[in-house]
């Protein structure tokens, strides 16, 4: 807390300008009117202040707006945003995408801080859904943003927003998140032709069911091994050797290097060894010839 001291003669700020640049903490407190600061916040970003000085300016705004800052002030916070706590931000009502962009710009280069996470949360809740423009903005600043959302939160993403998603935005998504995103992507890209569709849908395939993988295997897509390894194990297991061969195309040879890793390992265990041998890759661990395979799950379903 800054002590209340009288402003020295001739030091009263008539406007926010660089004459304040070397004011001591107590001088800023005594000589800068909070209402003046609020109306001239845009000027603060043209003046280099120390963090200590920024603390004083924040304190003034807090006193002026105990219920939370108006958006006209928030939009021009600049580096002062770095001084805000999540508790401060929860009092805000941010509706303009321009305001969001301005504050994310200040935080550029930093990891997503609790302040930024709170800001985004407030903004998205205020909008009701994660629309394309917002998603575009957020993933531009934070490529991992989508994967930081829960499946429940992802359910509010409209399919139209999926067009803004880049492959790197999904790098850290887990299967539960891709389960939610995949149907949206399928819907978003449904009117594209085969090869273009595959390019767009590829990053989302970690959420694809077996029937969609079977359909893709009929389209000469040549899926790479990196994508195949990210597929759901339960979706890969029912695929036949012929279907996997068609799905991977020339990349099928990569199965040998991955034979000890899921989902390849589990898939091999489900295939007849003779079928695996047709690939000529030396894959071992399939069901020996002459063995009868009982699908117990099917039996249970029938009973």
């Amino acid at each position: 807390e800054v002590e209340k001291t009288a402003c020295p003669s001739g030091k009263k700020a008539r406007e926010i300008d660089e004459s304040l640049i070397f004011y001591k903490k107590w001088e800023l407190e005594a000589c800068v009117d909070a209402a003046l600061l609020a109306t001239q916040m845009d000027r603060v970003n043209a003046i280099p202040f120390t963090y200590e000085q920024l603390d004083v300016l924040k304190h003034k705004l807090d006193e002026l707006y105990p219920q939370g800052y108006p958006e006209s002030v928030i939009q021009h916070l600049g580096y002062l945003f770095l001084k805000m706590s999540p508790e401060d931000i929860r009092k805000w009502n941010v509706t303009s995408l321009e305001t969001l962009k301005a504050l994310l710009e200040v935080n550029k280069g930093h990891e997503m801080s609790p302040q930024v996470a709170t800001l985004i949360d407030r903004f998205v809740k205020g909008r009701g859904q994660l629309d394309k423009d917002t998603l575009d903005t957020l993933t531009a600043f934070y490529p991992g943003y989508l994967c930081s959302l829960s499946p429940e939160e992802l359910s509010s993403v409209p399919p139209s927003s999926i067009w803004a998603v880049r492959p790197q935005d999904l790098d850290t998504c887990d299967p539960r998140q891709l389960d939610v995103l995949y149907p949206k992507a399928r819907l978003a890209f449904q009117n594209m032709n085969g090869s273009e569709y595959f390019v767009k849908i590829q990053s989302f395939l970690g959420g694809a069911p077996t029937e969609d993988l079977k359909a893709l295997s009929q389209q000469n897509v040549s899926m790479d091994l990196a994508t195949f390894m990210k597929l759901r194990t339960d979706a890969v297991l029912p695929l036949t050797v012929a279907e996997v061969q068609k799905l991977l195309g020339p990349h099928v040879e990569g199965l040998k290097a991955e034979e000890r890793h899921r989902p390849v390992r589990d898939w091999i265990l489900r295939q007849r060894q003779d079928d695996l041998d047709t690939l000529g890759l030396g894959l071992q661990g399939g069901i020996p010839n002459g063995y009868l395979v009982l699908d117990l799950s099917m039996q249970e379903a029938l009973s």
Epitope: E18, S19, A46, I47, F49, Y51, E52, L82
Partner: antibody
Framework: EVQLLESGGGLVQPGGSLRLSCAAS????????MSWVRQAPGKGLEWVSA????????YYADSVKGRFTISRDNSKNTLYLQMNSLRAEDTAVYYC????????????WGRGTLVTVSS | IQLTQSPSSLSASVGDRVTITCRAS??????LAWYQQKPGKAPKLLIY???SLESGVPSRFSGSGSGTDFTLTISSLQPEDFATYYC?????????FGGGTKVEIK
């Protein structure tokens, strides 16, 4: 090209005076606060003085207060440091440095000019 | 505010992970910058706001910390990284620098 170029250094006797200049190019000079930072031979960096974009506000380290004067001529894109009553401990390479627009760290430095105070 | 860097010098090999610390005599939030200086050259900004990488600086450099304790890390030392590194606080006036850490070839 964005750059800063210092000049004016040299050998001077204790008690003498020297004026350093720093010519700026490649950016809007008047929009940025500027600083002088020095480095004694084999030693670390020391912030000496700073000036606001318009030149209206100045700051000095206690070690040079009353002896050094910082100024700028925005029409010539030049920063100055007038050094009077020089002492042996003022011997150093003097760098001029540009402050970023909002905070007090330096994103551009000159190559420096050596000031030697010796009898 | 006094900034104390440690170690004052260190020997390392190309490919090594190098960590330099900077301790402030009082809390400075994240108001810290790191600079690299090579002999006879001007300092060069590497990191600002304790952890933000300056544009054009290789990603092997990273900064962390807040309050009084800060760290500069070089994940895999390259031949061009042998230099002296300085921290600087911009929390309040007067601005101050650490004493420097010289990184030498082992």
């Amino acid at each position: 090209e964005v750059q800063l170029l210092e000049s004016g250094g040299g050998l001077v006797q204790p008690g003498g005076s020297l004026r350093l200049s720093c010519a700026a190019s490649g950016f809007t000079f008047s929009s940025y606060a500027m600083s002088w930072v020095r480095q004694a031979p084999g030693k670390g960096l020391e912030w000496v003085s700073a000036i606001s974009g318009s030149g209206g506000s100045t700051y000095y380290a206690d070690s040079v207060k009353g002896r050094f004067t910082i100024s700028r001529d925005n029409s010539k894109n030049t920063l100055y440091l007038q050094m009077n009553s020089l002492r042996a401990e003022d011997t150093a390479v003097y760098y001029c440095a540009k402050v970023i627009r909002q905070l007090w760290y330096f994103d551009l430095w000159g190559r420096g000019t050596l000031v030697t105070v010796s009898s | 505010i006094q900034l104390t860097q440690s170690p004052s010098s260190l020997s390392a090999s190309v490919g090594d992970r190098v960590t330099i610390t900077c301790r402030a005599s009082q809390g400075i939030s994240s108001a810290l910058a790191w600079y690299q200086q090579k002999p006879g050259k001007a300092p060069k900004l590497l990191i600002y706001d304790a952890s933000s990488l300056e544009s054009g600086v290789p990603s092997r450099f990273s900064g962390s910390g807040s309050g009084t304790d800060f760290t500069l890390t070089i994940s895999s030392l390259q031949p061009e990284d042998f230099a002296t590194y300085y921290c600087q606080q911009f929390n309040n006036y007067p601005l101050t620098f650490g004493g420097g850490t010289k990184v030498e070839i082992k």
